[in-house]
Amino acid sequence: MAVTACQGLGFVVSLIGIAGIIAATCMDQWSTQDLYNNPVTAVFNYQGLWRSCVRESSGFTECRGYFTLLGLPAMLQAVRALMIVGIVLGAIGLLVSIFALKCIRIGSMEDSAKANMTLTSGIMFIVSGLCAIAGVSVFANMLVTNFWMSTANMYTGMGGMVQTVQTRYTFGAALFVGWVAGGLTLIGGVMMCIACRGLAPEETNYKAVSYHASGHSVAYKPGGFKASTGFGSNTKNKKIYDGGARTEDEVQSYPSKHDYV
């Protein structure tokens, strides 16, 4: 039960995380104009991975896409790549984890297969989360560097009559969404990996039960329960939930009309 809960929770947390990564990637507010001591601005600039926007105090908002690939900074391209890799890995991980969920029955899939799939999806979620965190962190670092550079520029060359208003950019909402989402995906992946460790011993015990079942030590009980005697810790009755999954050993040993795990 704890394993199923851990697996299910890991899946849900990862799902929320990946949704957050997708949201962050699509958001326009990766960097926003630093308002420093002026909270009200006539023209407010903010930028995303795919386009930059300007919101006037009149309420008019205009966004322009980055229609060039070669003209964009390499760092921005790298961030885009990391976020896309994170989304792709996360999406594949979600797909794999759906089939790996203990509460879902798919044909005659073994628990060992489910354990492997759980581990695979867990690793995918971890890598996906790390990609998102890395992408957001690279962008944040780029912002910090540019911020101090433009701050330095603001206080140089002011001797002339004409001043240039230097637009400084600071962290946008998307960065925080990305960090949190990446963290959630990472936690979800770790939970899936923990769930996998919990799935593996159960599967081993069941194989042992099935393997030794050629003797008379296995009793059949009505109502879909199976009792096993004399096999270490596996002495509890287990309710059967999967209507058609059995191990190779069972198929050979019990050509029965009942399905047991």
């Epitope: 006539a42 600039n45 105090s57 009149s58 322009r64 240039t164």
Partner: antibody, heavy 118, light 113 residues
């Protein structure tokens, strides 16, 4: 047709306060920032402040801070500008103006002449 | 605050001739985000409120005759009336629409020669 109709001319004593109204019609009052601009005789136009009728949020020119208060009554589609501690140099024509794209003023009230004299 | 200086203070031009008014800003009015210049031009006739002519330095307001045009970028801007008409006699103002507080030029009085 968009219209901004302002209250009539006022004559005030130094130290007194004046409250000018601006009634909007022909558009959704709560959708546009309303600004106040004044023009003293022979002087350039001077921006005083603004209010967003929907939220009620305001922003004032530092020069007038503490003396000017801009309010609104959404039910009456009216904006108000109150200037206190009047001085002779506050004698001017006061305009309300609607802000549009490009942070420009596309519609203006007819103006309210405020004369400060002892 | 941004200071706008218009030149000349007054201008006399013959009917049908070209009139040019300049506006210089103490700071750049070019916004890097959308590459737009936040400078506006108004026309004010005696006893009337100002009338919007041009925003974003060169975008003509709807209903404004096409003889009015705006140009310039950064700190130097120009309002041009290609062929002066009698009804164009007025005072023209430029406005900083980029940062608060919004500021205006001192005005240029346009007359017929």
């Amino acid at each position: 047709e968009v219209q901004l109709v302002q209250s009539g001319a006022e004559v005030k004593k130094p130290g007194a306060s004046v409250k000018v109204s601006c009634k909007a019609s022909g558009y959704t009052f709560t959708s546009y920032w309303m600004h106040w601009v004044r023009q003293a005789p022979g002087q350039r136009l001077e921006w005083m402040g603004m209010i967003h009728p929907n939220s009620g949020s305001t922003n004032y020119n530092e020069k007038f801070k503490g003396r000017v208060t801009i309010t609104r009554d959404t039910s009456a589609s009216t904006a108000y500008m109150e200037l206190s501690s009047l001085r002779s140099e506050d004698t001017a024509v006061y305009y309300c103006a609607r802000l549009k794209t490009g942070n420009s003023f596309d519609y203006w009230g007819q103006g309210t002449t405020v004369t400060v004299s002892s | 605050d941004i200071v706008l200086t218009q030149s000349p203070d007054s201008l006399a031009v013959s009917l049908g001739e070209r009139a040019t008014i300049n506006c210089k800003s103490s700071q750049s009015l070019l916004n890097s985000g959308n590459q737009k210049n936040y400078l506006t031009w108004y026309q004010q006739k005696p006893g009337q409120p100002p009338k919007l002519l041009i925003y974003w330095a060169s975008t003509r307001e709807s209903g404004v005759p096409d003889r009015f045009s705006g140009s310039g970028s950064g700190t130097d801007f120009t309002l041009t009336i290609s062929s002066l008409q009698a009804e164009d006699v007025a005072v023209y103002y430029c406005q900083n629409a980029y940062t608060y507080p919004f500021t205006f030029g001192q005005g240029t009085k346009l007359e017929i020669k």
